[in-house]
């Protein structure tokens, strides 16, 4: 049962990671700049995201603007967008692969094939986690590097936004969940069934048995 429990935990973590990744990509809070000081202009906070930027006035009023022209955007922003979308799609693909190989599904009858599919889904989730990590870390690096940006003065330093923390959490969950799914697969996929067969049955080869004939706990 421990193996099944780890699988469930792994897929729950990856699902949480995927949701976190989606929210992180969508929210315009990758870079946060506070404009507060002696001015005729109302103090404001600027949120910059992958798809839009928002200005929040101290009065509570918020204005958001979607970036219009794709070509006019900085290349690192375009790359971050692409990686975010790819990471989410890769994770979805991983989920489909997992569902095909999950214990509770009958898409694949063969035990070894099921184990391989779960292992593959784990690897795919780990890849998705790494893909999520790249734009988040790159953006964080860019914010820290902003010390040298002529546009960003001392009182207007960009800070790490909530989306980056969500992105790190998403990446961690995807890596952890994917890792758990990889760990639930024993190195010898057919070892469990053959032991069972040797001890309790000599009447039929393992390959001829149906998926529900043996206790689930013996299988990946």
């Amino acid at each position: 049962m421990a193996s099944a429990g780890m699988q469930i935990l792994g897929v729950v973590l990856t699902l949480l990671g995927w949701v976190n990744g989606l929210v992180s990509c969508a929210l315009p809070m990758w870079k946060v700049t506070a404009f507060i000081g002696n001015s005729i202009v109302v103090a404001q906070v600027v949120w910059e995201g992958l798809w839009m930027s928002c200005v929040v006035q101290s009065t509570g009023q918020m204005q958001c603007k979607v970036y219009d022209s794709l070509l006019a955007l900085p290349q690192d922003l375009q790359a971050a967008r692409a990686l975010c979308v790819i990471a989410l799609l890769v994770a979805l693909f991983g989920l489909l692969v997992y569902l095909a190989g999950a214990k509770c599904t009958t898409c694949v009858e063969e035990k070894d094939s099921k184990a391989r599919l779960v292992l593959t889904s784990g690897i795919v989730f780990v890849i998705s986690g790494v893909l999520t990590l790249i734009p988040v870390c790159w953006t964080a690096h860019a914010i820290i590097r902003d010390f040298y940006n002529p546009l960003v003065a001392e009182a207007q330093k960009r800070e790490l936004g909530a989306s980056l923390y969500l992105g790190w959490a998403a990446s961690g969950l995807l890596l952890l969940g994917g890792g758990l799914l990889c760990c639930t697969c024993p190195s010898g996929g057919s070892q469990g069934p053959s032991h069972y067969m040797a001890r309790y049955s000599t009447s039929a080869p393992a390959i001829s048995r149906g998926p529900s004939e043996y206790p689930t706990k013996n299988y990946v």
Epitope: G37, N38, I40, N149, Q156
Partner: antibody, heavy 117, light 107 residues
Framework: QVQLVESGGGVVQPGGSLRLSCKAS????????MNWVRQAPGKGLEWVGL????????IYNQKFKGRFTLSVDKSKSTAYLQMNSLRAEDTAVYYC??????????WGRGTLVTVSS | DIQLTQSPSSLSASVGDRVTITCSAS?????LHWFQQKPGKAPKLLVY???NLPSGVPSRFSGSGSGTDYTLTISSLQPEDFATYYC??????????FGQGTKLEIK
């Protein structure tokens, strides 16, 4: 109270050089970028460039890159616009303006530069 | 470079009139601001980020618009409002440009 005061304008011959100053007071000088904007007589406003007093970083309007140079002296809370190879069409009032949250919120009164032989 | 075109270039109106000045950009802008300039004076910030009024600017001034088309409206002209008005854009990349100006004169 935020105040910007330009100085250094005057009459200069074509091909000559001039350095304009913008003395800032009433706020943390290194906290905000400083822009330079010019206005030819009877004409509209034209953005020249900006400098970040915090790190000395500059961005220029390509039209002026090479001939105009922006600099700062943090100890004097002063921004400078060095203009070389001046032409008749550079005759204008030159303003410095503080940048606050992508907005030019405070402007100096301007200093007139006349390029004439 | 993003070009800003203001219309009209000049406008005659009377005290109490409602006046509208438009600013059209050649492509979408991130921030659009309006400035008022009186003869011999430096420009003064009038509206920032499309529709926000700095402290000290009367509420008869208002701004609106999005994308490439923006508007400055003076609901009821006062004698001190006769001046030249400029729009200015801030996009992702410089240079940041100004409109050619709209001169508001007394009729």
């Amino acid at each position: 109270q935020v105040q910007l005061v330009e100085s250094g304008g005057g009459v200069v011959q074509p091909g000559g050089s001039l350095r304009l100053s913008c003395k800032a007071s009433g706020y943390s000088f290194t906290g905000y970028t400083m822009n330079w904007v010019r206005q030819a007589p009877g004409k509209g406003l034209e953005w020249v460039g900006l400098i970040n007093p915090y790190n000395g970083g500059t961005i220029y309007n390509q039209k002026f890159k090479g001939r105009f140079t922006l600099s700062v002296d943090k100890s004097k809370s002063t921004a400078y616009l060095q203009m070389n190879s001046l032409r008749a069409e550079d005759t204008a009032v030159y303003y410095c303006a503080r940048d606050y949250g992508f907005v030019l919120d405070y402007w100096g009164r301007g200093t007139l530069v006349t390029v004439s032989s | 470079d993003i070009q800003l075109t203001q219309s009209p270039s000049s406008l005659s109106a009377s005290v109490g009139d409602r006046v509208t000045i438009t600013c059209s950009a050649s492509s979408s802008v991130s921030y659009l601001h309006w400035f008022q300039q009186k003869p011999g004076k430096a420009p003064k910030l009038l509206v920032y980020s499309t529709s926000n009024l700095p402290s000290g600017v009367p509420s008869r001034f208002s701004g609106s618009g999005s994308g490439t088309d923006y508007t400055l409206t003076i609901s009821s002209l006062q004698p001190e409002d006769f001046a030249t008005y400029y729009c200015q854009q801030r996009s992702i990349y410089p240079p940041w440009t100004f409109g050619q100006g709209t001169k508001l004169e007394i009729k």
